[in-house]
């Protein structure tokens, strides 16, 4: 269940940084914003839950990475990839992408100028 830690390699690389952070609060935060009325998500009840819980932890995790456009984009792509299969239709995919692109701004980070969120072979 727990994270495989201590993978050696260049600790400054975006891949290593994205691998070290916990992106689940970001995923929950976005799902809460687009599915607030839905009963269950990922076995955690999001009814009447303040999104600020997830947002604070999400921003803390994103803050752990070097604040570069490339690393932020890789993190957003990873979030998109992790949640792709849970997004039920095209409209939900678009909503998720919109919220995802707003995430850096919500955390007071620079948003990546160009970040292709089309992942999973075009499914998302």
């Amino acid at each position: 269940m727990r994270r495989e830690r201590g993978r050696q390699g260049d600790s400054s690389s975006c891949e290593r940084q994205v691998d070290r952070v916990n992106l689940k609060p970001c995923e929950q935060h976005i799902m809460q914003r687009i599915m607030g009325e839905q009963e269950q998500y990922d076995s955690y009840d999001i009814r009447s839950t303040r999104s600020s819980d997830q947002q604070q932890r999400c921003c803390d995790e994103l803050n752990e990475m070097e604040n570069t456009q490339r690393c932020m984009c890789e993190a957003l792509q990873q979030i998109m990839e992790n949640q792709c299969d849970r997004l039920q239709d095209r409209q939900m995919v678009q909503q998720f992408k919109r919220e995802l692109m707003n995430l850096p701004q919500q955390c007071n980070f620079r948003a990546p100028q160009r970040c292709d969120l089309d992942v999973s072979g075009g499914r998302c």
Partner: antibody
């Protein structure tokens, strides 16, 4: 063996200062957020402060804000708590605790704790 | 600040009985950020449950957690002698990461 060992506690007068240390071993220290939690004699647990892996995000309990400073040295596998302007109510056992998270579902938890170091503030 | 209120303050039961411990939050807490710890006299706290309902490593299945929003519960289905201790809930989603005041589970 995964271990946290606190040191630096002792008797200090009100208004005085103390620096607590926590030595980590048996795991990659720089991969974990760290916390200080205290427990006054006969009382419950009180979260004091937390610091993220790279020290970029730090939080404090309102009761210690402006008086205590948390820091870490990843090269030395050490966590610190600088305590200034100490008050009687800061008397407690201070625990250092490692914070991990479940990679598959995301929740955070403090899974490794030191045995604690005792701080007594008294004139 | 989110205030966590645990009840009862003290619970007196016998081995073999069922224990139900409550933790109520002053504001809604995602169950992703609700943790339970056990502490015995003279010892450091021990992680029991995280994400409200996931047992930590080596925690026996007589321990279970449930709840959402503002109401959370820790249940011990059949008390063993080693279960008598103080139990704390904690929320770690929003700083300050507050603890409840604890429930002391004592032998009747």
């Amino acid at each position: 063996e995964v271990q946290l060992v606190e040191s630096g506690g002792g008797l200090v007068q009100p208004g005085g200062s103390l620096r607590l240390s926590c030595a980590a071993s048996g795991f990659i220290f720089s991969d974990y957020n760290m916390n200080w939690v205290r427990q006054a004699p006969g009382k419950g647990l009180e979260w004091v402060s937390s610091i993220t892996r790279s020290s970029r995000t730090i939080y404090y309990a309102d009761s210690v804000k402006g008086r205590f400073t948390i820091s870490r040295d990843n090269a030395k596998n050490s966590l610190y708590l600088q305590m200034n302007s100490l008050r009687d109510e800061d008397t407690a056992v201070y625990y250092c605790a490692r914070e991990d998270f479940d990679v598959s579902t995301g929740p955070y938890y403090m899974d490794v704790w030191g045995k604690g170091t005792t701080v007594t503030v008294s004139s | 600040e989110i205030v966590l209120t645990q009840s009862p303050g003290t619970l007196s039961l016998s081995p073999g009985e069922r224990a139900t411990l409550s933790c109520r939050a002053s504001q809604s807490v995602s169950n992703m950020f609700l943790v339970w710890y056990q502490q015995k006299p003279g010892q450091a706290p021990r992680l029991l449950m995280y994400g409200a309902s996931t047992r930590a490593t080596d925690i026996p299945d007589r321990f279970s957690g449930s709840g959402s929003g503002t109401d959370f519960t820790l249940t011990i289905s059949r008390l063993e002698p080693e279960d008598f201790a103080v139990y704390y809930c904690q929320q770690n989603g929003n700083s300050p990461y507050t603890f409840g005041q604890g429930t002391k589970l004592e032998i009747k």
